[in-house]
Structure formats: C-alpha cells, structure tokens
Interface confidence: low
C-alpha cells in the first residue's frame, strides 16, 4: 500500500494509472467503500462522500490512462485509505494528513516560550524535527517547546514530520518582539542635547500599546518615572512627562526621546518598557547616560564623569599634543596649577576615546613681590 503525506489546508494529488493509455472507466472510493468520484464517459461524476466539494480530478490526463484524485483544503479527518478501481484492479493509497500550529500567536515577546503542536491522524506515530532560523534543532512528538525565545529565533521555522519513511515539511513564520538592543550607553558632555533611540527589531503594520521610561539617577536614592506614553497604530502620544527633566518624544517609530541637556544629576540608568496590546509581558531596553564635566576652579583643573562607567574605563587630563598629565581608572581626576593652554579631558576604553571635553586654561600674571 502506497503512503502519501499531506498538510492540513493544502491540496494533495493521489495518482492512479491504468495500463491502457486511454480514457476508461474508473472510480475512487474511501475505506468505507463510499464512492468519491469517477467518470462516465468524458464526464466527472461525484459520489456522496464528505469530500464532495473538495474532490476533483484532472480530465486532461484521462486520455493518458491517468486518473488522479485531487483533494483540496485537506483536513486531518481526510486521513484514510483511498481505493482507485480501474481495469479490474484496485490501487490503494493511504493518505495521512498532518497539521502544525503555533500554540498561540506567532508574534511572541523575547523570553517567552514557543509551543508547536502537531495534529495527526489516529493510529499514526510521527516524529517531528524543527530547525530554528539560527540553526538550532529540536525534536519531539505531538508537541515541541522552546523556552526563552531569543531575537535570533525570529524568522521561518522549518519543521519536518516523519511517518512511514515519508516526510512532509511545514514552515512557520515566528516574529520575536524585542528591541534591537537589550542595552545601550550614551556618552555626553555636560550641556549637550541627548538623543535616546529605541528601535524595534520587528515590523508590523499596526502597533498599539503603552510604555514608560523609569530612570535611576546615580545621585538619587530611588528611581523615577520620566515619561509615560501611548502607542496607537505606530503613532506615539505622550501621556505624562516630568518637568525636570522635560523629555521630548518623537511622534513616530522608532521610539525616540530627547533630553534637552546632559547634566550630572541626570546621569544614570533608565529602563524603557513597552506593553503591547493583546500581549502578556513587556519589552524592555536599558539605556545608560554618562555625563562629563571639566572645570577650572582657582588653581585646580578637574575632570569628572557621572553615570554607569565600567571599572576598566580610563579618565585622563592632558595638555593638547602632550602626554597625559594624569590618567586614572576613577571618576574624577585633577591637576593643580595647570599650565596655560588647551587641556583635554578624555574618557577612553582600551585606547578608544568615548568622550572628550576641552577647557582652556589662561596664563596667570603674577605681580612681582616688592622688596
């Protein structure tokens, strides 16, 4: 008995060939001997089976002795043994229809679980293997689960169902809803305008939800909500914003926030959360702000940074075009009685300058001491 695998919703063509290469009488029946379709001369006739409106044949092939049974919009319950009777012979074809669906939505939040469920006919014992877009293979029976979805899991999952040494392939498009970056850091000199961008790693024509940016300033004892907003059809509308700092928000995606100026009291870490309509859970992106200030007070030239810097970052003070006068893995450095000229304060990581602030030191004219 020939075995053919089909996919739920697809079309399958079961073949039946006569030895004579001409149009002769044939008919297809199911295992209950109920006639599905056949011919009467050059006419297609249909029987009383439940397949009536979904069954067809290819008349153009009859003259060649081929009498296929075409079943459209396959259902799991179409799984059966189909019998083609032609020229006093019977050809049996076992059709097994499988379906593979994602547990809920195919749009899932980063960190959520994906469950794929296999629908299979009674009596079958298929095995399933799925390959994620990043090449990870998972195997299972009726259900396959992947916990903690990552951004790289977005894309087409290819699943192969194996039964009786035959296989059928399913493709399921999964979208992992996440920000492009889990975390970002912005380095600014005091007084500069700060731009925070929160690009999403997915696109949908409609996007509705609400969000909030909580900020933990380095100098503050507790975190504070800086802004809350709504997202409707990708249009952003601000619901509430603090007066200090007075953030501005772009009206379109990607989510974009502007801090009028970088100040030491704003340096710290923020967490932007986005709750999407009809989704449980939230998207998160961390953003960090490091602020630098260079000052000269009397005979002391000081450079300071505030915010979440890593211990390996180096802070230096140097006179332009000269070696660094002072370099430390600390958040403040200073030089007493600095020479006149343009001084540079540099925050660097393994030689790469992340932030630079220049300050001009003027010569001091000392009046001669009288004898």
């Amino acid at each position: 008995k020939k075995v053919v695998l089909g996919k739920k919703g697809d079309t399958v063509e079961l073949t039946c060939t006569a030895s004579q290469k001409k149009s002769i009488q044939f008919h297809w029946k199911n295992s209950n001997q109920i006639k599905i379709l056949g011919n009467q001369g050059s006419f297609l006739t249909k029987g009383p089976s439940k397949l009536n409106d979904r069954a067809d044949s290819r008349r153009s092939l009859w003259d060649q002795g081929n009498f296929p049974l075409i079943i459209k919009n396959l259902k799991i319950e179409d799984s059966d043994t189909y019998i083609c009777e032609v020229e006093d012979q019977k050809e049996e074809v076992q059709l097994l229809v499988f379906g593979l669906t994602a547990n809920s939505d195919t749009h899932l939040l980063q960190g959520q679980s994906l469950t794929l469920t296999l629908e299979s006919p009674p009596g079958s014992s298929p095995s399933v293997q799925c390959r994620s877009p990043r090449g990870k293979n998972i195997q299972g029976g009726k259900t396959l689960s992947v916990s903690q979805l990552e951004l790289q899991d977005s894309g087409t999952w290819t699943c192969t169902v194996l039964q009786n040494q035959k296989k059928v392939e399913f493709k399921i498009d999964i979208v992992v809803l996440a920000f492009q970056k889990a975390s970002s850091i912005v380095y600014k000199k005091e007084g500069e305008q700060v731009e925070f961008s929160f690009p999403l790693a997915f696109t949908v024509e409609k996007l509705t939800g609400s969000g909030e940016l909580w900020w933990q300033a380095e100098r503050a004892s507790s975190s504070k909500s800086w802004i809350t907003f709504d997202l409707k059809n990708k249009e952003v509308s601000v619901k509430r914003v603090t007066q200090d700092p007075k953030l501005q928000m772009g009206k379109k995606l990607p989510l974009h926030l502007t801090l009028p100026q970088a100040l030491p009291q704003y340096a710290g870490s923020g967490n932007l959360t986005l709750a999407l309509e009809a989704k449980t859970g939230k998207l998160h992106q961390e953003v960090n702000l490091v602020v630098m200030r260079a000052t000269q007070l009397q005979k002391n030239l000081t450079c300071e940074v505030w915010g979440p810097t890593s211990p390996k970052l180096m802070l230096s003070l140097k006179l332009e075009n000269k070696e660094a006068k002072v370099s430390k893995r600390e958040k403040a450095v200073w030089v007493l009685n600095p020479e006149a000229g343009m001084w540079q304060c540099l925050l660097s990581d393994s030689g790469q300058v992340l932030l630079e602030s220049n300050i001009k030191v003027l010569p001091t004219w000392s009046t001669p001491v009288q004898p």
Epitope: L151, Q180, P199, T203, E205, K234, L253, P254
Partner: antibody, heavy 118, light 111 residues
C-alpha cells in the same frame, strides 16, 4: 537632512548580475527600513523587497525571490541590492527608498539605470 | 497580492481647474479605522514624491491643493486647482499588505 545617494548607471549582459548601492545620511541608519523599487522604461513602480539595516534581515517580493539579495554595511551606512540572472526585462531604473512609517516611501534615492542588453 | 487599478490612464485639465484621479484596490486596504493608501507624484527623470499617506494625510511640504479621500477599496486624489508644476504621473500605493503594490499611474497634462 535625509539623503539617499545611489551608484551610477550600469550596462549588463543577459545572465550577468548587477549590484547597486545606496548610501544613507542625515538620520540614524539602523532605525529605518530601506526598500528597493524598480521602474521599467515607461512603466509603473514595482516593490522588490526591503532590508532592516539594524538586524540585516531582508524580505523579498516573491517575484524576485532567488534572484535578489539585499545587504547592508552599517560602518558606511550603505545598503546594496544585487540582482542575478539578468534578462532584458530587468532593464529599469532601480530606486532605494526609506520608509517613514509602515510601507510608505518618504525619501527616495535618485535612481540607478540598469540596462540589460546583449 | 493586492492589485491596484487607476483611472483614467491620462487626464487633461485646464489651469486652475480641478483634477480627480481614482484608484481601486482588489480588496479592502482598511485596518482598524485607517486606510493604508498612499499617493505619489513623479515628474520625468525624478524619483516619486510622497504626497498623501493613510488615504488623506498631507505629507509635510506638499501644497494643500492636493487632497486624498476614500476608504475600503475606492480612493481619490484631488488637485483642487491645477498648476503648471503639477504636470506629472500620479501613482496610488497600498501599504496594508506585503508586497506593497502600486497602481499603473495616471498622466496629468494641461488642456
């Protein structure tokens, strides 16, 4: 201001490949989708596909699948569109276009004429 | 794919007169209260320019003599008082579904 500057005109033989570049400036390159749209001489506009510069993910019109490849270089803020197995009917002006929101095209490159002729 | 059909193919209108271009989609381009229909203007040797988005929103910098209307499958671009600089080909485009598809274009000339 936002600018998309494309590479110059190309003449190719049937069966060859062409690679057109589109250099973006004036905005955060990774934040917006870049699409490629072509226009055959005296004809209408046809969307070929799009690339997400942040992730490098690309989505193609079924009509061009298997023949088109879209890539990006974030270090130079440049997007590339390569079309292979060229035929005479691929003779067209190829535009890159930046989406504003959804699939509407707010900013366009100047266009690159690709002529396929034996 | 959603098929966009524009009419007429060409249109000759006197200066200062109203020009109306129609666009019909093979299926509704409405979703959640919005119509995902855009209109572009293209002059010879230039890339298209976005005029109207989401059926009736005027893109910034576009003169207000241009307006868009419609919903579902039937849409209209109107130029209330045709100017010499409006001579161009106009295209409609749906942005509801991938692939985005364009109409065949309507050539607007001065009578």
């Amino acid at each position: 201001q936002v600018q998309l500057v494309q590479s110059g005109a190309e003449v190719k033989k049937p069966g060859a490949s062409v690679k057109v570049s589109c250099k973006a400036s004036g905005y955060t390159f990774t934040a917006y989708v870049i699409s490629w749209v072509r226009q055959a001489p005296g004809q209408g506009l046809e969307w070929m596909g799009e690339i997400y510069p942040g992730s490098g993910s690309s989505y193609y019109n079924e009509k061009f699948k298997g023949r088109v490849t879209m890539t990006r270089d974030t270090s130079t803020s440049t997007v590339y569109m390569e079309l292979s197995s060229l035929r005479s009917e691929d003779t067209a002006v190829y535009y890159c276009a930046r989406s504003g929101d959804g699939s509407r095209f707010v900013y366009w490159g100047q266009g690159t004429l690709v002529t396929v002729s034996s | 794919d959603i098929v966009m059909t524009q009419s007429p193919d060409s249109l000759a209108v006197s200066l200062g007169e109203r020009a109306t271009i129609n666009c019909k989609a093979s299926q509704s381009v409405d979703y959640d209260g919005d119509s995902y229909m855009n209109w572009y203007q293209q002059k010879p040797g230039q890339p298209p320019k976005l005029l109207i988005y989401v059926a009736s929103n005027l893109e910034s910098g576009v003169p207000d003599r241009f307006s868009g209307s419609g919903s579902g499958t039937d849409f209209t671009l109107t130029i209330s008082s045709l100017q010499a600089e409006d001579v161009a080909v106009y295209y409609c485009q749906q942005s509801l579904q991938d692939p985005p598809t364009f109409g065949g274009g309507t050539k607007v000339e001065i009578k």
